[in-house]
């Protein structure tokens, strides 16, 4: 359907593919790509070559190529400013002659190792009540946090640590649509650190 918008997720500095998925390559005359402005035109190559790209905006020079035979478009060395809406007007030899495919490109950083910080709420009768906070280095969009083995969601975890839980390891996993990364802290280390007055744990 012309109205459908396909979300494409890309990683900063890496490549992303827009799935055009042309079923009949021989019918293609030209595909015109636009975003905020004209981006590129893609025309058939000869029998030996992939489709030929003409990049029309200098921000995309030498970062775009098209794959044969399905005309999927690849943008490499992704920049944050590449994010946004893209439109492919596909001109063919046969009816319907022109069809449009729409895309929304979201760009994310590949997540680094998260950092776990801790603060002591209370320590009573050999039970320590600790709050763990998990965060990635740069404030990122669409980052979710999960703690194992408890299965808790969110970047803050409050735990009541008893001597019987000494062998537990708490792992925080940060995830965005393109990557995930984890850090862990052992319960034994946690309460030992608290006893010694430390407030931060970071394995990275």
């Amino acid at each position: 359907k012309d109205s459908e918008i396909f979300t494409v997720n890309g990683i900063l500095g890496e490549s992303v593919t827009f799935p055009v998925n042309i079923q009949e390559p021989r019918q293609v005359k030209i595909i015109a790509w636009t975003s905020k402005t004209s981006v590129a035109y893609v025309t058939p190559g000869d029998s030996e070559t992939a489709p030929v790209v003409t990049v029309t905006h200098r921000n995309y020079y030498e970062r775009i190529h098209a794959l044969g035979p399905n005309y999927n478009l690849v943008i490499s060395d992704l920049r944050m400013e590449d994010a946004g809406d893209y439109k492919a007007d596909i001109n063919t030899q046969a009816d319907p002659y022109t069809t449009t495919k729409r895309y929304n490109l979201q760009i994310y950083r590949r997540l680094g190792k998260p950092k776990i910080t801790q603060s002591l709420m209370a320590s009573v009768n050999s039970t320590c009540n600790v709050t763990l906070t998990c965060s990635v280095e740069k404030e990122e969009k669409n980052v979710t946090y999960n703690w194992s083995p408890l299965g808790e969601e969110g970047n803050v975890l409050q735990i009541f640590q008893t001597p019987e839980d000494q062998e537990l390891t708490y792992t925080c996993t940060a995830q965005n649509p393109v990557s995930n990364n984890s850090d862990s802290i052992s319960a034994r280390q946690l309460c030992a650190d608290i006893a010694m007055g430390f407030r931060t744990h970071h394995t990275g």
Partner: antibody, heavy 116, light 106 residues
């Protein structure tokens, strides 16, 4: 047999306009870029712009925006380039050429002389 | 825009001699194409996609290069090769040409 037949030489006054043509035969006119190139006497080739007749898409060299206007008539397989506000700097031979990978084939050239 | 610089601007070679001319791009390009133009005639596509010979081009011609540096080589110069050769980058609009290398026969 591919052929690009360009219109004849033009002698025009400064400040006026000229429209030159390039009639294509021997290939599917709507499926390829049709480009225009300027060559002044004793000089190299300058790319002006091109048009894809099958969609009406046009690329211009920034230098020639406002100077050159590219159009195409798919019914007669003919491309046109109009040059406006002519000066002596516009005196040159203008070539048309077609292709999607490179300029595969070129017309014979149209000489435009701007003189009062 | 991407600027193509051809060197030398003019050169001469004796029959049988090996000839190399270069085309340098101001920033990286995927391919260049080469055109041959003889005086008073239209240019002809000569080498495309950096190294593919156009139909009818003698095998003594070859093209190579990548990134910002490209070259056209004639293994053994012949009189009919005397012409001006232009490189062009196609994939980034505007589709710029180099200034040309005029090859003369000694």
């Amino acid at each position: 047999q591919v052929h690009l037949q360009q219109s004849g030489a033009e002698l025009v006054r400064p400040g006026t306009s000229v429209k030159i043509s390039c009639k294509a035969s021997g290939y599917t006119f709507t499926n390829y870029w049709l480009g225009w190139v300027k060559q002044r006497p004793g000089h190299g080739l300058e790319w002006i712009g091109d048009i894809f007749p099958g969609g009406g898409y046009i690329n211009y060299h920034e230098k020639f925006k406002g100077k050159a206007t590219l159009t195409a008539d798919t019914s007669s397989s003919t491309a046109y380039m109009q040059l406006s506000s002519l000066t002596s700097e516009d005196s040159a031979v203008y070539f048309c050429g077609y292709g999607n990978i490179a300029m595969d084939y070129w017309g014979q050239g149209t000489s435009v002389t701007v003189s009062s | 825009q991407i600027i193509l610089t051809q060197t030398p601007a003019i050169m001469s070679a004796s029959p049988g001699e090996k000839v190399t001319m270069t085309c340098s791009a101001s920033s990286s390009v995927s391919y260049v194409h080469w055109y041959q133009q003889k005086s008073g005639t239209s240019p002809k596509r000569w080498i495309y996609d950096t190294s593919k010979l156009a139909s009818g081009v003698p095998a003594r011609f070859s093209g190579s290069g990548s990134g910002t540096s490209y070259s056209l080589t004639i293994s053994t110069m012949e009189a009919e090769d005397a012409a001006t050769y232009y490189c062009q980058q196609w994939n980034n609009s505007p589709r710029t040409f180099g200034g040309g290398t005029k090859l003369e026969i000694k």
